[in-house]
């Protein structure tokens, strides 16, 4: 069974930037790719990027950077300021689409113990 | 304009065979998933058979696994659908259709239709 | 497979109703539905995607809601030539699966 993969990490040097990466771990090859904050697109979450391997990438502030790093893993950095900026304990969601399998979604947070002056 | 156009249809005995065709023009077809749906006589739509833009997946109804086949030219901008030991079951109206990414894979276009008739 | 259950088969009402069709999922298919229209004599045509959202030109007393197992379909201020079939679809996981339809007649 198909799985996706989501990993929130805040950055060492702005507190509160962050970056998201999702991974899926299935057979299928990847149709689109949507991240949103605030829990799934549509179930009150709203979209921060969404990424088509051909058609290419359209992305929404806070995000600064989304990007392919493999055919079936994306990264999005988040900016760190303004009034929407992200905090600690905000809900990043991956939704990859796959056809025609279908869709496959999980979400993921800052883990709790994460201190960012660690992770330089 | 988007236009999708069935073709191949008609009267055909029990056990026999028919090869459907769909042209699309109006949009790059090589970029779009496609598929056929059948509308039975009770008016119920099903999905017989679905093929990514990239030719590697596949997707078939379980009643037509085995009998029917999807294919595409990419060149020809044309979709088929290659059914064999047709059966009663297998009467309905058949469409052709495209799948838009951004859409969550929602049907955007249909064609007109063509009509199977298996007869004994 | 998912099974998209869709309530009422029927309805009858007068021009300037407001209409609702609902569509109950068998699990959970996220927010990845669409909604169709079949006028008489002719093929299904997309009105609605990820639930809520209008395909061009549809007009916006059409309206869509839900997420998970339970959405809803709207028609505001019904008209004349909103007679048709109705069909809700899953596209969360294969097979996509429609909805049994609901045929709408006006008084």
């Known amino acids: 069974t198909p799985e996706v993969w989501v990993q929130v990490r805040m950055e060492a040097t702005e507190l509160s930037s962050f970056t998201i990466r999702c991974g899926f771990l299935g057979s299928g090859s990847i149709s689109l790719v949507t991240v949103s904050w605030g829990g799934p697109n549509g179930a009150g979450g709203t979209t921060l990027a969404v990424l088509h391997p051909e058609r290419g990438i359209r992305q929404w502030a806070p995000a600064r950077q989304a990007r392919w790093e493999t055919q079936s893993s994306i990264s999005l950095i988040l900016e760190g300021s303004g009034a929407s900026s992200p905090c600690a304990n905000t809900t990043f969601c991956c939704k990859f689409a796959s056809f025609p399998e279908g869709s496959w979604e999980a979400c993921g947070s800052l883990p709790p113990s994460s201190d960012p002056g660690l992770s330089a | 304009d988007v236009k999708l156009v069935e073709s191949g249809g008609g009267l055909v005995k029990l056990g026999g065979s028919l090869k459907l065709s769909c042209a699309a023009s109006?949009?790059?077809?090589?970029?779009?998933?496609m598929s056929w749906v059948r509308q039975t006589p009770e008016k119920r739509l099903e999905l017989v058979a679905a093929?990514?833009?990239?030719?590697?997946?596949?997707y078939y109804l379980d009643t037509v696994k085995g009998r029917f086949t999807i294919s595409r030219d990419n060149a020809k901008n044309t979709l088929y659908l290659q059914m064999s030991s047709l059966k009663s079951e297998d009467t309905a109206l058949y469409y052709c259709a495209r799948h838009e990414d951004y859409y969550g894979f929602a049907m955007d276009y249909w064609g007109q239709g063509t009509s199977v008739t298996v007869s004994s | 497979s998912i099974v998209m259950t869709q309530t009422p088969k029927f309805l009858l009402v007068s021009a300037g109703d407001r209409v609702t069709i609902t569509c109950k999922a068998s699990q959970s298919v996220s927010n990845d539905v669409a909604w169709y229209q079949q006028k008489p004599g002719q093929s299904p045509k997309l009105l609605m995607y990820?639930?809520?959202n209008r395909f061009t030109g549809v007009p916006d007393r059409f309206t869509g809601s839900g997420y998970g197992t339970d959405f809803t379909f709207t028609i505001n201020t019904v008209q004349a030539e909103d007679l048709a079939v109705y069909f809700c679809q899953q596209a969360y996981r294969s097979p996509w699966t429609f909805g049994g339809g609901t045929k709408l007649e006006i008084k």
């Open positions: 990820y639930v809520s």
């Open positions: 093929i990514n833009s990239n030719v590697i997946s596949t």
């Open positions: 109006g949009f790059t077809f090589s970029s779009y998933h």
